[in-house]
Interface confidence: low
């Protein structure tokens, strides 16, 4: 999946299986990523687990679990708030669109989380205070916390190299290792589809093009669009909303704030 | 143990906003508390040792004494809860300040710096 980190780095990761997205004293978020097509390096999020840890007079431990085709509007125990403590309503889950869009507000840690199902896969977005982001017991063990550190270099897909190939007249086989992708989805069509929803040619737009060329699944256009929309709602600095690629000096680590 | 059901029914019956009951609401509030107490008694056998259950029982006793509610008296009819418009606070009036990050943060310093992380697509 594509990852925008807390430090506004933008990466395309091929991480497969379960990976920690956030792991701090208050909150644990884990995603499970699966290959989008047989033989493809590209993966998308098929499962998401959020654990809100027990906190003072505010909330009991609450677990939220979403999977493909199952986006619940309640925590695993059936509740919609933080439990039975005085401040239980400082954690609240709201269904925005049934089966498609859920928002979780954790006021006790100043955090808002948006989970969506777009097509077959899940998207995740969070707004969190720096103080909460950095509230970790043991800094040394936080190496693979994706939202903070990003993906390991060997798990990143070189977005720009892919794009350079895709822009050439014939699409190389490497761009799409799976025969399932329809040959009738040329680069120009992908660009047109993405331009419709994402008029600014930023990294969300580039991600959209990459996804369409890799999978042929137009739902990924919406995934990029909603990721940007959620960013508009959740990012505190509107000037940094659109990310643009750096020059070619940084292989594998595409991005940073404009 | 159906304590969560008792809790949610009580909150539904009493969440008319973020304020404590006004003096003319007290009879209604006491009736809701008595209903809450009745609900906890009905589920008592299956809730032995459940911390949420014992917290509720203590909480009811505290609220009954705070609002001078008599143990005997009318109970409230369960009512369908109408959700407040989006953006309205549904936080209980006794929610500690520590459970509202921004409120407790502003006491000590300027507004917090927020960060954003997102994951999408392939």
């Amino acid at each position: 999946p594509h990852l925008r980190t807390f430090t506004d780095h933008f990466q395309t990761c091929k991480v497969q299986g379960a990976w920690p997205l956030i792991d701090n004293n208050y909150l644990n978020v884990q995603v499970t990523n699966t290959p989008v097509l047989p033989g493809s390096a590209a993966t998308a999020t098929s499962k998401l687990t959020i654990i809100f840890k027990n906190f003072q007079e505010c909330v009991d431990q609450k677990v939220y679990q979403a999977e493909m085709d199952e986006l619940p509007s309640a925590f695993a125990d059936g509740s919609k708030n933080g439990g039975d403590k005085h401040g239980a309503n400082s954690l609240k889950i709201t269904e925005k669109v049934s089966g498609q869009h859920v928002e979780i507000q954790a006021k006790y840690i100043g955090t808002t989380i948006v989970v969506r199902q777009v097509g077959r896969y899940l998207t995740f977005a969070v707004r969190m205070p720096e103080e909460v982001v950095n509230a970790v017991e043991d800094r040394d063990s936080q190496g693979l916390y994706l939202c903070l550190r990003g993906c390991p270099l060997n798990q990143q897909i070189d977005f720009q190299a892919f794009r350079a190939n895709a822009e050439s007249p014939r699409r190389p086989a490497a761009a799409s290792p799976s025969p399932v992708v329809p040959e009738t989805f040329p680069y120009e069509t992908a660009v047109a589809k993405c331009k419709e929803k994402l008029p600014v040619e930023d990294l969300y737009y580039q991600a959209c093009v990459f996804d369409l060329l890799t999978t042929g699944d137009v739902n990924f256009t919406l995934a990029a669009y909603y990721a940007l929309e959620d960013g508009k709602m959740l990012h505190s600095n509107k000037d940094k909303l659109h990310l643009f690629e750096r020059t070619r000096e940084l292989p594998g680590a595409v991005a940073a704030a404009a | 143990c159906k304590i969560l059901k008792c809790n949610s029914e009580f909150w539904s019956a009493t969440s008319s906003g973020s304020h404590a009951p006004a003096s003319d609401d007290v009879p209604e509030f006491c009736a809701a508390l008595r209903t809450y107490a009745l609900c906890t008694r009905r589920t008592a056998r299956t809730c032995r040792g459940d911390l949420a259950y014992h917290s509720a029982v203590h909480g009811i006793e505290d609220l009954m004494s705070q609002h001078n509610c008599s143990k005997d008296g009318p109970t409230s009819q369960p009512r369908v809860r109408t959700l407040p418009p989006a953006g309205d606070s549904q936080e209980r009036s006794d929610s500690p300040e520590i459970c509202h990050y921004e409120k407790s943060f502003h006491k000590h310093s300027a507004a917090p710096n927020y960060t954003h992380c997102g994951l999408f697509g392939d």
Epitope: N25, N28, I51, K53, N54, F55, Q56, E57, D60, Q61, V63, A76, K85, H86 | C1, G49, D50, L51, A52, S55, H58, P96, I98
Partner: antibody
Framework: EVQLVQSGAEVKKPGASVKVSCKAS????????ISWVRQAPGQGLDWMGW????????NYAQKLQGRVTMTTDTSTSTAYMELSSLRSEDTAVYYC?????????????WGQGTLVTVSS | QSALTQPRSVSGSPGQSVTISCTGT?????????VSWYQQHPGKAPKLMLY???KRPSGVPDRFSGSKSGNTASLTISGLQAEDEADYYC?????????FGGGTKVTVL
Amino acid sequence: EVQLVQSGAEVKKPGASVKVSCKASGYTFTSHGISWVRQAPGQGLDWMGWISPYSGNTNYAQKLQGRVTMTTDTSTSTAYMELSSLRSEDTAVYYCARVGSGPYYYMDVWGQGTLVTVSS
Amino acid sequence: QSALTQPRSVSGSPGQSVTISCTGTSSSVGDSIYVSWYQQHPGKAPKLMLYDVTKRPSGVPDRFSGSKSGNTASLTISGLQAEDEADYYCYSYAGTDTLFGGGTKVTVL
């Protein structure tokens, strides 16, 4: 250094009450809960309950309901556990422990223990 | 009767590995990230060894590790040393007030 220092050993008669104190230092007292745990001679650990110094909220073990009272004094950063109607089976070492983040979370700092002997 | 079941005793020679299990229910162990482990030497207060199933507080040697599978949490001591001989207790919140396991005596042969 984070420390919990408990009051000294007590000998009580059946039917009496005992009040054990636990003085905290080295951290913000109201930021963590205090749990009380006891251990009868040769037996395992037995959770008695929890108190939040921040709000005074308590959770007591079912079997001790009505006999145990936990309180705190934030001005002196001290937690208290009072057990009434003592019986011989209450003979135990009583520990206070700081709770990491909430009532049921891990106990990261422990007091040295207070031996309470109930004997006629 | 404890809601968390531990073996009464385990033993091993110095340098060997031993594993202590702690079996509960789905709510007490299976779905919980709050399993912690305590070491207690005779006549001493318990000491936190692991929390959140796998995390080690500073000062605890890395030969102590934790894991969880289904409704069973485990504490493993690899490279057993003489000073590891003690009682070990697991602890978890289960929605009830029986939170400690019965304890396991670890003997270093």
